[in-house]
Each structure stands twice: as C-alpha cells, then as structure tokens.
C-alpha cells in the first residue's frame, strides 16, 4: 500500500502529523492567535509538546533568522501562573529558559538566545513573529 503524507498549506512545513506556519509579521499574542485561526483547519498558535518537536521547529526557523523571538501558543490567561496551551494540549513538556518573575509577562515566546529551543515569558502586547500549527 502507498501511504500518502498529508499535504500542508503552501508555505507551511510538515512534521509528525502536523503542519506549521512561521510568519515573520509583527503581531501581539492575541492578534497572532486570531491570524492563526483565520487560516482554518483548526490552526492555533503552536503548541510544542516534545524535545523532538522543539528541535525540528528550531532548525526550520534558524534557516530564516536567529535573532527575533517568536510567539507560541502558551499563555497564562488568568494571570495565576497556570500556563496552558491555547489549542488545549496538556502542559507536560516544558522548556523554560529559567526564572522570569513579575512584569505582567503572561504569554510565551521561543527565545532566540538558545536557538529557539527554550521559551521565555513576555508581555502579551509585544509585537513579534509567530508560529501557527494545525493537524491536516
């Protein structure tokens, strides 16, 4: 039997049953999430659920740039240090880059400091690049 790999939207890349779109537009976190949703297919800002997934994404983004942080789908909507993925995935894998205390930082970004393998919290109104994800 020939098993066809699902195709992703033009400009998106495929990895392990998911499609990812990296957008080098500047958006705040909530506008980035709305834009991800606007692409359909159940897309959201990306959840990153394993080191393998993180490494694949980091390698892809490093081919474009190495200095700008990128919004992902992790946030703290009630401002209670109870972080959650916007797509409903379980918050099990974590790759924070150390402590980040105070300052109303309730949205997560992939940090350029460690080649996009680790995350930092930031103020949700910052305008940054963003990464979307959906399952085709």
């Amino acid at each position: 039997d020939i098993i066809m790999r699902p195709s992703c939207a033009p400009g998106w890349f495929y990895h392990k049953s998911n499609c990812y779109g990296y957008f080098r537009k500047l958006r705040n976190w909530s506008d980035a999430e709305l834009e991800c949703q606007s692409y359909g297919n159940g897309a959201h800002l990306a959840s990153i659920l394993s080191l393998k997934e993180a490494s694949t994404i980091a390698e892809y983004i490093s081919g474009y740039q190495r200095s700008q942080p990128i919004w992902i789908g992790l946030h703290d909507p009630q401002k209670r240090q109870q972080w959650q993925w916007i797509d409903g995935a379980m918050y099990l894998y974590r790759s924070w880059s150390g402590k980040s205390m105070g300052g109303n930082k309730h949205c997560a970004e992939m940090s350029s400091n460690n080649n996009f393998l680790t995350w930092s919290s930031n103020e949700c109104n910052k305008r940054q690049h963003f990464l979307c994800k959906y399952r085709p």
């Epitope: 240090q81 109870q82 409903g88 924070w96 205390m101 105070g102 109303n104």
Partner: antibody, heavy 122, light 112 residues
Framework: EVKVVASGGILVQPGGSLKLSCIVS????????MSWVRQNPEKRLEWVAE????????HYPDTVKGRFIVSRDNDNNILYLQMNSLKSEDTAMYYC???????????????WGQGTSVTVSS | DVLMTQTPLSLSVSLGDQASISCRSS???????????LEWYLQKPGQSPKLLMY???NRFSGVPDRFSGSGSGTDFTLKISRVEAEDLGLYYC?????????FGGGTNLEIK
C-alpha cells in the same frame, strides 16, 4: 527571611468599612501573586481575594465580590484589602498569603502572615 | 463552585501509627492544562496555616517525608506514615485549579 505582617483588624459595625494592610519583606514582592484568606470562628478557611504580580488582575469569590477590593503597592511592599458594606459573616481572622512561583509554575500558598482579626458586630 | 469534602472530621491516632485523611471534590479538579492544583495545609494550635503538599503529591520544602499525597480526578488522600506529636492540628485540602479556589472543611488530628 520572608515576613508577612497583616494589620488593621478591629471591631466594626455592620455596614461599615475597613482597610487591612499587609507589609512584606524578605522577598521581591512585585514578583509574586498575593491573596487574602480568612478563617471564621468555626475555623473554616475561605479564599477572599487574589491579585497578580503587576496588580492589574484581581479575582474574588461571589461572597465578597463588589464589596472587597484587593490592591498592592509594589514600591513599598504593601498588600491591601478594602472591605466595604461589612456583614456579621465577614467576622474572621484575615491572613495575607504569598503564592509560591518561579514565574512559570504555581507551588501553593507558601507563606502566611500571622493574621489580623476583624469582628463585625453592633 | 467546587465543593471540597474532607473525611473524617476528627482523627485520633497513637504516636507512630499511620493517619489517612480523605478529600473529595464535587467535580474533577484537573486544570485544563492537565495539572491538578490540589494542596494540603496544616494549622497547628495557635499558628497560621502552613503549606504541606502542592500539586497533589509534591512536598513543600522542609516537610518531612512521612507526609505523602496521592489521588486524581475527584479523590485525594494525605497520609502520615508515622505520626509524631508535632503533627497534631487542623488539616485542610485546597483546590486551586478552578476559580474560586476552595478549601475543605478541615480534619482535626489528635494524638491518643
């Protein structure tokens, strides 16, 4: 050493107002979520207010919503609880509490003050 | 609101024996992120409550390893493997997964 010292509790008449204060030291106050928890004379504990690190987000249970206001002064390390339209059922020991966190995770209410007693009675 | 029900209300235990306190919630207290923010507090006579356990089974720093927490969904248990005199007091469970956070009614541990 972490210190959490609440004050302001007194005897007040029903319908009256009161402002509790909590002065903290020994940690970076502006980095932590803070709450007020009360314990009634029957020893029941009730969470009554919470405020995030920056002071821009608050949460209350229905029992005090619209009557109590939590606020904070991050420059002077003070947590406040403004209590209005007080009722007899607000009679309790009020504790000022720190929420343990590293910014990415919540570890429980790790430091409690000694409490300040509020009695609402005519 | 999530109702937290503790049993028993009172517990009398001999020194060195095991004590077990149950806490049941009226609905599942797993947060939508998958973590269960269930805590246990001990209030010794004349003192403020102190944190014992967080996220069901994690001991707070300085808490002896004779204390252990377990459970999931709606049923949770705090066990003290060998009760010591300093363990007497009021034990409270607390859920912080859903607003408003709520406490159990308390269990009074006495030493026989």
């Amino acid at each position: 050493e972490v210190k959490v010292v609440a004050s302001g509790g007194i005897l007040v008449q029903p319908g009256g107002s009161l402002k509790l204060s909590c002065i903290v030291s020994g940690f970076t106050f502006r980095s932590y979520i803070m709450s007020w928890v009360r314990q009634n004379p029957e020893k029941r504990l009730e969470w009554v207010a919470e405020i995030n690190d920056g002071g821009s987000y608050t949460h209350y249970p229905d029992t005090v919503k619209g009557r109590f206001i939590v606020s904070r002064d991050n420059d002077n390390n003070i947590l406040y609880l403004q209590m209005n339209s007080l009722k007899s059922e607000d009679t309790a020991m009020y504790y000022c509490v720190r929420h343990g966190s590293n910014g990415y995770d919540y570890f429980g209410m790790d430091y409690w003050g000694q409490g300040t007693s509020v009695t609402v009675s005519s | 609101d999530v109702l937290m029900t503790q049993t028993p209300l009172s517990l009398s235990v001999s020194l060195g024996d095991q004590a077990s306190i149950s806490c049941r919630s009226s609905q599942t207290i797993a947060h939508r992120n998958g973590i269960t923010y269930l805590e246990w507090y001990l209030q010794k006579p004349g003192q403020s409550p102190k944190l014992l356990m967080y996220k069901v089974s994690n001991r707070f720093s300085g808490v002896p390893d004779r204390f252990s927490g377990s459970g999931s969904g709606t049923d949770f248990t705090l066990k003290i493997s060998r009760v010591e005199a300093e363990d007497l007091g009021l034990y409270y469970c607390f859920q912080n997964s859903h607003l408003p956070p709520t406490f159990g009614g308390g269990t009074n541990l006495e030493i026989k």
